[in-house]
């Protein structure tokens, strides 16, 4: 049994890091493999992650971590029984994939303005809380070409757009994702999408 593709990990910079790797053949990840991880710090304890299958030869493990900070570094040991298959390390702050924003809501009762709001996925005491920027994707269910991205570079989790910038009388969907420049993160997954019917009053011809 050998590792074909070494583990690569990403952290949500809060409580979970996800590691993925590939074996050289079909493997029952949960029964044959264990990923041990330990913070390089005084008094830290070794933890065991039981991997799940991710395709025939692929495995994925969700590592639970407390109080993740930029100074943290973890040792990783991948075991098959008594055999050490791979040894490495992982610094969560250097491989961050933020959590997806939640609670995306479209408020259509503001006169001829669409207000989109969502929730920051981090608590206020997490460093990323004040460092997320967002991308909002809006698209038409009727017209695949009507697809647009709005970059929200301010901290407030909201976006205002004129309803007239979208076609009236048709349904739209929106979703939002986040990233943080400070840790050069990847983009988060998209939030679940939300749907609304766009209608606004056409201005009267003079």
């Amino acid at each position: 049994m050998k590792v074909l593709q070494e583990p690569t990990c990403v952290s949500d910079y809060m409580s979970i890091s996800t590691c993925e790797w590939k074996m050289n053949g079909p493997t029952n990840c949960s029964t044959e493999l264990r990923l041990l991880y330990q913070l390089v710090f005084l008094l830290s304890e070794a933890h065991t992650c039981i991997p799940e299958n991710n395709g025939g030869a692929g495995c994925v493990c969700h590592l639970l971590m407390d109080d993740v900070v930029s100074a943290d570094n973890y040792t990783l040991d991948l075991w098959a029984g008594q055999q050490l298959l791979w040894k490495g390390s992982f610094k969560p702050s250097e491989h961050v994939k933020p959590r997806a924003p939640g609670n995306l809501t479209v408020h259509t009762n503001v006169s001829d303005t669409l207000l989109l709001t969502w929730s920051n996925p981090y608590p206020p005491d997490n460093y990323l809380y004040n460092h997320l920027t967002y991308a909002v994707n809006i698209w038409s269910e009727n017209d695949p070409a009507d697809f647009r991205i709005y970059n929200v570079t301010y901290l407030e989790p909201s976006l205002r757009i004129a309803a007239s910038t979208l076609k009236s009388g048709i349904s739209y969907r929106a979703r939002v994702r986040a990233w943080a420049q400070c840790y050069n993160t990847t983009w988060s997954e998209w939030s679940p999408s939300t749907k609304w019917h766009n209608s606004y009053r056409e201005p009267f011809e003079q």
């Epitope: 710090f41 005084l42 008094l43 830290s44 304890e45 407390d66 109080d67 900070v69 930029s70 100074a71 943290d72 005491d125």
Partner: antibody
Framework: QVQLVQSGAEVKKPGASVKVSCKAS????????MHWARQAPGQGLEWMGI????????SYAQKFQGRVTMTRDTSTSTVYMELSSLRSEDTAVYYC?????????WGKGTLVTVSS | QSVLTQPPSVSAAPGQKVTISCSGG????????VSWYQQLPGTAPKLLIY???KRPSGIPDRFSGSKSGTSATLAITGLQTGDEADYYC????????????FGTGTKLTVL
């Protein structure tokens, strides 16, 4: 919000022991390390040791090895620091502080006076 | 005796900028992360800067930290009378057993 509430001031005689408590609230107690530091009157901060509330393991500054014991009670979210064989130089304010590489939150401190 | 050396005192007028240095070595500041703590008279220390240059929420951007080699600096701009306090740097000794270190402390007086 996070609170670290320490026990009240103590006056001890040389050679005695003192046990200071620090009750934590407002966060997951076993998810954060707890440090102890002290500050003698008019002096700077001095680190004493650290406890991992999850398993109870400890590490002490070499200066205090053999004299200090740190324990925790997860049922009450409380950590304790006991210092034995007290001498006058141990007169100080003793602080508990939550954190790992840096100390996010501090208790208000407990004044321990050692005097004959 | 701390191996992190700070000036015993610094002073400046309100509105001015002041810097406080923290000098260490390759086995501490040079190989670890620096934090800064503010201790107002009669109170417990409070985290001001961590990870060399990051501010906890609620700390105004008048406070900033930097690190270069084996030294670190705390800068305070737009000085206010409420900033009068003792300031301590902190880091880790990585030479033998990993253990925290505090600087000697600096008394800031706002004139």
């Amino acid at each position: 919000q996070v609170q670290l509430v320490q026990s009240g001031a103590e006056v001890k005689k040389p050679g005695a022991s003192v046990k200071v408590s620090c009750k934590a609230s407002g966060y997951a107690f076993t998810s954060y390390y707890m440090h102890w530091a002290r500050q003698a009157p008019g002096q700077g901060l001095e680190w004493m040791g650290i406890i991992n509330p999850s398993g109870g393991s400890t590490s002490y500054a070499q200066k205090f090895q053999g004299r200090v014991t740190m324990t925790r009670d997860t049922s009450t979210s409380t950590v304790y620091m006991e210092l034995s064989s007290l001498r006058s130089e141990d007169t100080a304010v003793y602080y508990c502080a939550r954190g790992k590489w840096w100390l996010y939150d501090w208790g208000k401190g407990t004044l321990v006076t050692v005097s004959s | 005796q701390s191996v992190l050396t700070q000036p015993p005192s610094v002073s400046a007028a309100p509105g001015q900028k002041v810097t406080i240095s923290c000098s260490g070595g390759s086995s501490n500041i040079g190989n670890s992360y620096v934090s800064w703590y503010q201790q107002l008279p009669g109170t417990a220390p409070k985290l001001l800067i961590y990870d060399n240059n990051k501010r906890p929420s609620g700390i105004p951007d008048r406070f900033s930290g930097s690190k270069s080699g084996t030294s670190a600096t705390l800068a305070i701009t737009g000085l206010q009378t409420g900033d009068e306090a003792d300031y301590y740097c902190g880091t880790w000794d990585t030479s033998t057993t990993l253990q925290p270190l505090f600087g000697t402390g600096t008394k800031l007086t706002v004139l």
